[in-house]
Amino acid sequence: ATKLTEEKYELKEGQTLDVKCDYTLEKFASSQKAWQIIRDGEMPKTLACTERPSKNSHPVQVGRIILEDYHDHGLLRVRMVNLQVEDSGLYQCVIYQPPKEPHMLFDRIRLVVTKGFSGTPGSNENSTQNVYKIPPTTTKALCPLYTSPRTVTQAPPKSTADVSTPDSEINLTNVTDIIRVPVFN
């Protein structure tokens, strides 16, 4: 049986979560992919998604979230920058495959963000809005809205996460345009 597993990351405010979700190259390279949060007692919410079809190595930015899909490697890279305490929660990657239901990858990420000096360049105890570097050409994608009432019971995402500081400069604001998306079994 598939075990629902989680991997925990304990970070401080201002740091960056960097997750690489591993998918089957041949099946899903150009499929639209999404990053979701699962809050207790709620359906998963889609925070950001790639374009449709997903473009190779093309950054998509939604607020403080940056997605990059590396088709040649079968990896979706998800970065959440300038983390805030309220970002703490359970996250997962999914692949949209209409008309079929979304395909969930493996290993959810349990993010725990605490207050305190992170010791990371670009963040300090007094800053409320940091400047982070991301690739200059970013796009915001619209995510599909699914309406099936069924709840999540299938395997969580396989991902491959680390903590990092991104690479080229832009001001990032809070996450916007969060779309409520049920995920199905």
Epitope: K27, G74, L75, R77, T160, V163
Partner: antibody, heavy 119, light 108 residues
Framework: EVQLLESGGGLVQPGGSLRLSCAAS????????MSWVRQAPGKGLEWVST????????YYADSVKGRFTISRDNSKNTLDLQMNSLRAEDTAVYYC????????????WGQGTLVTVSS | EIVMTQSPATLSVSPGERATLSCRAS??????LAWYQQKPGQAPRLLIY???TRATGIPDRFSGSGSGTEFTLTISSLQSEDFAVYYC??????????FGQGTKVEIK
């Protein structure tokens, strides 16, 4: 409990071939990338090769590219490393390692199998 | 290829004392760093990942810090079972993923 058990090591002559296997249990094998990491006698760790959970993506260190082939059988929960054109410098303990669910580090290791390349 | 350099090569410490191990990357790896412990005749064991987060079952006397090119593994109060070789490893986006040459922590 995650368990990784390597086999197939032994003594082989330079230019020869050997096939290492790793039997995995205690986790959803097809959901995780797997790797081989080696350690020459008295030396440090060296990453050798990695294969994605589905087997669709493979990576190799330059030192083994074109000579070693990593593969997996998800129906049997096994990982293999086919080693051809072996050289003296390939002598090492070879570890099978599970790649973490969150990045390319290694959260579980087998006990290793010794490969000795010598005439 | 990113080169990982650990220092010192050998660290002599008395039980109960603090040990500080360093790892330096040849270019920025942000916090894409793991630490492993290896005892003689045994496989390595994951201690820290993402530069800061302790792996499951690792006691809190082990802590990781650093970002960019400079990283530290601290063992706050060395126990007899902590005398071993410690390796750092970078895991920036794509391979090769490289290890440091190791730091041996021995009894003083």
């Amino acid at each position: 409990e995650v368990q990784l058990l390597e086999s197939g090591g032994g003594l082989v002559q330079p230019g020869g071939s050997l096939r290492l296997s790793c039997a995995a249990s205690g986790f959803t094998f097809n959901a995780y990338a797997m790797s081989w990491v080696r350690q020459a006698p008295g030396k440090g760790l060296e990453w050798v090769s990695t294969i994605s959970g589905s087997g669709s993506t493979t990576y190799y260190a330059d030192s083994v590219k074109g000579r070693f082939t990593i593969s997996r059988d998800n129906s049997k929960n096994t990982l293999d490393l086919q080693m051809n054109s072996l050289r003296a410098e390939d002598t090492a303990v070879y570890y099978c390692a599970k790649v973490a669910g969150s990045n390319f580090f290694f959260d579980h290791w087998g006990q290793g199998t010794l490969v000795t390349v010598s005439s | 290829e990113i080169v990982m350099t650990q220092s010192p090569a050998t660290l002599s410490v008395s039980p109960g004392e603090r040990a500080t191990l360093s790892c330096r990357a040849s270019q920025s790896i942000n916090a894409n760093l793991a630490w492993y412990q290896q005892k003689p005749g045994q496989a390595p064991r994951l201690l820290i990942y993402g530069a800061y987060t302790r792996a499951t079952g690792i006691p809190d006397r082990f802590s990781g810090s650093g970002s960019g090119t400079e990283f530290t593994l601290t063992i706050s109060s060395l126990q007899s079972e902590d005398f071993a070789v410690y390796y750092c490893q970078e895991f920036i986006l794509f391979p090769p993923w490289t290890f440091g040459q190791g730091t041996k922590v021995e009894i003083k």
